[in-house]
């Protein structure tokens, strides 16, 4: 009678994460008697996956009915495969012995490779906002994929970017891998509505890449332009001065009127209008009682935008043509901001 052989017909098996792996094994004889065991890896550190004789292996089921008296099929299924299950699996026949069973013959082994999808790419931008013409960095990370081969691309508004660096870790063999990429993007004034997209393609995604996005509205700061103008006299002794704050982003803005360097009124931008490019415009006005002034008045519109140092624009108001009222040193009448916008 020929000696028992343990046959593992599959050198390798490729399984998607979450699926069930089937590892095939047959013996050519029932003799010598003794149990079959499955191990991952070889040598003293090998991991027991299934023991016919005893134990509880909740993820493992046998392909055939091992309670059949003539059974020689010891194939197993392992459910809910993860990248951590990758490795070489050995079907090993033991010969009964006392006190312990003795390893009799091993199959040649089946290498289980696990295909795992990358996680959704997460794109993150700089911690602080930056202004147009500056270069900012965006990072993209995706984890848990296998095999290692992966493609990452960057886009800004559908246009592919070329200035980026990508690393896949670890460099050596691993159950799963991570990708990290940093792209450099030059900001323009029109980028409030722009998007940066990181696109990851992997064999497990069947041609349908994963995308992560970042809105440049979270990154950009467009500083305002200021224009102070004097309007025609509304009534005798009154002048209307407007400060037009144009093309700013984000909305957070505080405006202060100064008369000859003294604070006259402070207000916060509330009812703004939005431009097509996503930036905002706002206008504030000041009604000045010129008869209250002996000398010319320097009116300054000072704007603090998004916590940045204030910018200002001044306007000299000539008052010499008007009769001066004695004993008056208050120059302005505080009013609400004009809700009309001037383009």
């Amino acid at each position: 009678e020929e000696e028992l052989q343990v046959i593992q017909p599959d050198k390798s098996v490729l399984v998607a994460a979450g699926e069930t792996a089937t590892l095939r094994c047959t013996a050519t004889s029932l003799i010598p008697v003794g149990p079959i065991q499955w191990f991952r890896g070889a040598g003293p550190g090998r991991e027991l996956i299934y023991n016919q004789k005893e134990g509880h292996f909740p993820r493992v089921t046998t392909v055939s009915d091992l309670t059949k008296r003539n059974n020689m099929d010891f194939s197993i299924r392992i459910g809910n495969i993860t990248p951590a299950d990758a490795g070489t699996y050995y079907c090993v026949k033991f010969r009964k012995g006392s006190p312990d069973d003795v390893e009799f013959k091993s199959g040649a082994g089946t290498e289980l490779s696990v295909r795992a999808k990358p996680s959704a790419p997460v794109v993150s931008g700089p911690a602080a906002r930056a202004t147009p013409q500056h270069t900012v960095s965006f990072t993209c990370e995706s984890h848990g994929f296998s095999p290692r081969d992966i493609t990452l691309k960057w886009f800004k508004n559908g246009n592919e970017l070329s200035d980026f660096q990508t690393n896949v870790d670890p460099v050596g063999e691993s159950v799963s891998y991570s990708i990290h990429s940093t792209a450099k993007v030059v900001l323009t004034r029109e980028d409030v509505h722009s998007q940066v997209i990181c696109e990851v393609a992997h064999v497990t995604l069947q041609g349908d890449p994963l995308r992560g996005t970042a809105n440049l509205s979270e990154t950009i700061r467009v500083p305002p332009t200021l224009e102070v103008t004097q309007q025609p006299v509304r009534a005798e002794n009154q002048v209307n001065v407007t400060c037009q704050v144009r093309k700013f982003y984000p909305q957070r803005l505080q405006l202060t009127w100064l008369e000859n360097g003294n604070v006259s009124r402070t207000e916060t931008a509330s009812t703004v209008t939005e431009n097509k490019d996503g930036t905002y415009n706002w206008m504030s006005w000041l009604l000045v009682n010129v008869s209250a002034h002996r000398d010319d008045v320097k009116l300054t519109c000072q704007v603090e935008h998004d916590g940045q140092p204030a910018v200002s624009k001044s306007h000299d108001l000539k008052v010499s043509a008007h009769p001066k009222e004695q004993g008056s040193n208050t120059a302005a009448e505080n009013t609400g901001s004009n809700e009309r916008n001037i383009y």
């Epitope: 029932l30 010598p32 016919q52 005893e54 309670t67 059949k68 008296r69």
Partner: antibody, heavy 117, light 106 residues
């Protein structure tokens, strides 16, 4: 706890039939092979038949043809259909759970079958 | 067929060995205790040397080739029973039993 309870025994005449049942509880019946073992009065144990979890059947040579072992996994019940009974079939019939290598680890209390004219 | 002695006796506390021969390398063995005729057998050893969880540790089993041995270390009065060796033969797919050994505790 593993429990095996046989039923269906009784007195029959030679040539008649009888169907024994064994109700199982306390373990995964559908995953285990099962057997019938009998013991004639004043005699030793004698294996009658076995059945795998999926229903493959095995018989002692002397009982092949007359006896049929079967199971209903949905009811956790093992059966033994006995036909053409003779006086030599008089015995206590036990059902037993098989181990991975077809030995027995748990037994029922038995049911007595008497074949007498 | 498996062959075992018809009877053995021992004093309480002694070690008793019951042997059973007639098997082969293709056999696995078990031992079953029956305290009275017609009562349910209780398995004390299966798979040559495995003890079910509710069986006292004084019961042990061993096997070598065609022979299996049941050892009761420190026998007690309640161990008095008939002990059947049983075997499963992988070459014939059949179970067999010995005729039984009556253990008397003196």
């Amino acid at each position: 706890d593993v429990q095996l309870v046989e039923s269906g025994g009784g007195v029959v005449r030679p040539g008649e039939s009888l169907r024994l049942s064994c109700a199982a509880s306390g373990f995964s019946f559908s995953s285990n092979a099962m057997s019938w073992v009998r013991q004639a009065p004043g005699k030793g144990l004698e294996w009658v038949a076995g059945i795998s979890a999926s229903g493959d059947t095995y018989y002692s040579g002397s009982m092949k043809g007359r006896f049929t072992i079967s199971r209903d996994n949905s009811k956790n019940t093992l059966y033994l259909q006995m036909n053409s009974l003779t006086a030599e079939d008089t015995a206590v019939y036990y059902c037993a759970r098989e181990t991975w290598n077809h030995l027995f680890d748990y037994w029922g209390l038995g049911t007595l079958v008497t074949v007498s004219s | 067929a498996l062959t075992q002695p018809a009877s053995v006796s021992a004093n309480p506390g002694e070690t008793v060995k019951i042997t059973c021969s007639g098997g082969s390398d293709s056999y696995y063995y078990g031992w079953h205790q029956q305290k009275s005729p017609g009562s349910a057998p209780v398995t004390v050893i299966y798979s040559d040397d495995q003890r079910p969880p509710d069986i006292p540790s004084r019961f042990s089993g061993s096997a070598s080739g065609s022979t299996t041995t049941l050892t009761i270390t420190g026998v007690r009065a309640e161990d008095e029973a008939v002990y059947y060796c049983g075997g499963y033969d992988y070459s014939t797919y059949t179970n067999t039993f010995g005729a039984g050994t009556t253990l008397t505790v003196l």
